[in-house]
């Protein structure tokens, strides 16, 4: 179907700031330093193209990307199809976050990205350090006490953890908008599933102990399970699409060069191993360090602690896809009753995991609802 790619989009070689300004939007770029020394790039689109004159405080919206991705996810489509631009044009102060290890968050005060130590993290640390540091920075910079949090995929995972374990952080979230939410992955049909029985020593042997590259492990499944079904041979070697799945019908294929050039944006082998642990256990819990002794060193208990989403009182609106391989509807079904302050839920039967950020009809199916809900919140 798309056997050959003709790069036509200038954004292919751009960074986040360049992508924002390319479309005529204002951009501010900051570096946020976490408590454990990671330097995360954060971008701000303070207003839209047509509302720069509006004075007064604009509600703050913070967008947090998902697994193997980066802030470019929110600005990879044309402005009328990209959530960050839509929100800016609707009059909001938009902030884009990056999780440690991705293209725009690959520096640390103490460790080089060439070191094993740099990559010794999973989504636990993203929730414990990255989110608080970024949200604190935004709150200080804007002078606003609360913000709206939009998470996709792992961006929802770290939100669930951070807002259920850190009450002072939770107070800063006005509403949590969760797209393709992931807590448990007991029923996932993602190819992560294939990794669940690989022991830690073998996992590290195959993938190394730094940045996660899909290696040739997945090749054996692609011909039958992914590529022949979709015929998108360009996507077949891309870790993001391999793990999250894809659906050509909803894609604007003219933007494929942008998606592929910016993704996968990178994460650690440890983070991917954490996800395989979650598939195997069927539980939502912290990283298992592999032995009771090591777990005691990290958690003061022999087993990794469970994350309790029932402790998260932040108002939350959820959108999930009926065809989502990673955030399987059955797992979402387990999650919803545990959310004490669920204010809205919509399942889009034909949506998969990546449709929430890139589908051509995402504005109609999801984004317009978010804009309306934030607008209602202002009143």
């Amino acid at each position: 179907l798309f056997g050959k790619l003709h790069p036509g989009s200038p954004e292919v070689t751009m960074n986040i700031s360049q992508m924002i300004t390319y479309w005529g939007y204002p951009n501010e770029e900051y570096e946020v330093v976490t408590e454990d020394g990671y330097i995360l790039e954060v971008n701000r689109i303070p207003y839209g193209k047509k509302n720069s004159g509006n004075t007064g405080q604009r509600p703050v919206v913070f967008l947090q990307h998902g697994l193997l991705a980066s802030a470019t996810n929110w600005i990879s489509n044309l402005p009328n199809n990209s959530l960050a631009f839509i929100l800016a044009d609707a009059g909001y102060d938009v902030w884009l976050g990056n999780s440690r290890g991705n293209t725009w968050a690959r520096r640390n005060l103490y460790y080089s990205p060439d070191s094993v130590e740099f990559w010794a993290f999973s989504f636990d640390e993203m929730a414990k350090y990255d989110l608080p540091a970024t949200i604190d920075f935004i709150v200080k910079k804007t002078g606003q006490k609360q913000l709206h949090y939009v998470g996709h995929s792992q961006g929802t995972t770290i939100g669930f953890i951070a807002f259920s374990t850190n009450p002072s952080l939770a107070k800063r979230i006005k509403t949590f908008y969760a797209l393709a939410p992931v807590a448990t992955v007991k029923y996932t049909k993602s190819l992560i599933n294939k990794l669940r029985f690989v022991p830690q020593s073998l996992f590290k042997f195959i993938f190394g102990d730094k940045i996660f590259y899909p290696h040739n492990f997945f090749d054996q499944f692609l011909a039958t399970e992914v590529c022949s079904r979709e015929m998108l041979n360009l996507l077949c070697s891309n870790a993001l699409f391999i793990i999250c799945g894809f659906d050509s019908k909803n894609f604007n294929t003219s933007r494929l060069d942008v998606y592929l050039s910016h993704n996968p944006a990178g994460t650690s082998v440890q983070n991917m191993f954490h996800w395989t642990q979650a598939v195997k256990s069927g539980k939502f819990q912290a990283y298992d360090w592999g032995s009771p002794v090591q777990n005691r060193m990290h958690y003061d208990q022999s087993q990794p602690p469970y994350y309790n989403v029932t402790a998260m009182n932040v108002p939350i609106a959820v959108w999930n896809g009926g065809k989502d391989l990673l955030a399987d509807p059955q797992d979402v079904g387990l999650l919803l009753p545990k959310l004490p302050n669920l204010i809205y839920h919509k399942e889009i039967p034909f949506y998969n995991h990546l449709d929430f950020i890139w589908a051509m009809d995402a504005p109609q199916e999801v984004y317009n609802d978010i804009v309306s809900m934030i607008s209602e919140d202002k009143k």
Epitope: F197, V198, L202, N216, D219
Partner: nanobody
Framework: QVQLQESGGGLVQAGGSLRLSCAAS????????MSWYRQAPGKQREPVAA???????TYADSVKGRFTISRDNIKNTMYLQMNSLKPEDTGVYYC?????????WGQGTQVTVSS
């Protein structure tokens, strides 16, 4: 449930060769990864070679260029060809397989390399 059984271990002089076999009950075609582990005396078991279903291989630095992992899906057997053996290659060698239902271990076979 796949059962694995190693054979081919023994005593060999430094510089010599051995070929280990790992016979499976059931189809090894269903295993995503087949691997050989070594447990040296007083040490933990660690992987030395792995073979993905796609045919790609990974080796520990200490055995690169000397060991070769392969499989024969018709005979349901995996092999480890070990050349230019060194005393530090001494240990119990285990074959392992990972599939949709679990991770399986063999009982192990002793390899002793004398100097």
């Amino acid at each position: 449930q796949v059962q694995l059984q190693e054979s081919g271990g023994g005593l060999v002089q430094a510089g010599g060769s051995l070929r280990l076999s790992c016979a499976a009950s059931g189809s090894i075609g269903s295993l995503y990864v087949m691997s050989w582990y070594r447990q040296a005396p007083g040490k933990q078991r660690e992987p030395v070679a792995a073979l993905m279903g796609s045919g790609s291989t990974t080796y520990a630095d200490s055995v690169k260029g000397r060991f070769t992992i392969s499989r024969d899906n018709i005979k349901n057997t995996m092999y480890l060809q070990m050349n230019s053996l060194k005393p530090e290659d001494t240990g119990v060698y285990y074959c392992a397989g990972t599939g949709a239902e679990g991770h399986y271990w063999g009982q192990g076979t002793q390899v002793t390399v004398s100097s």
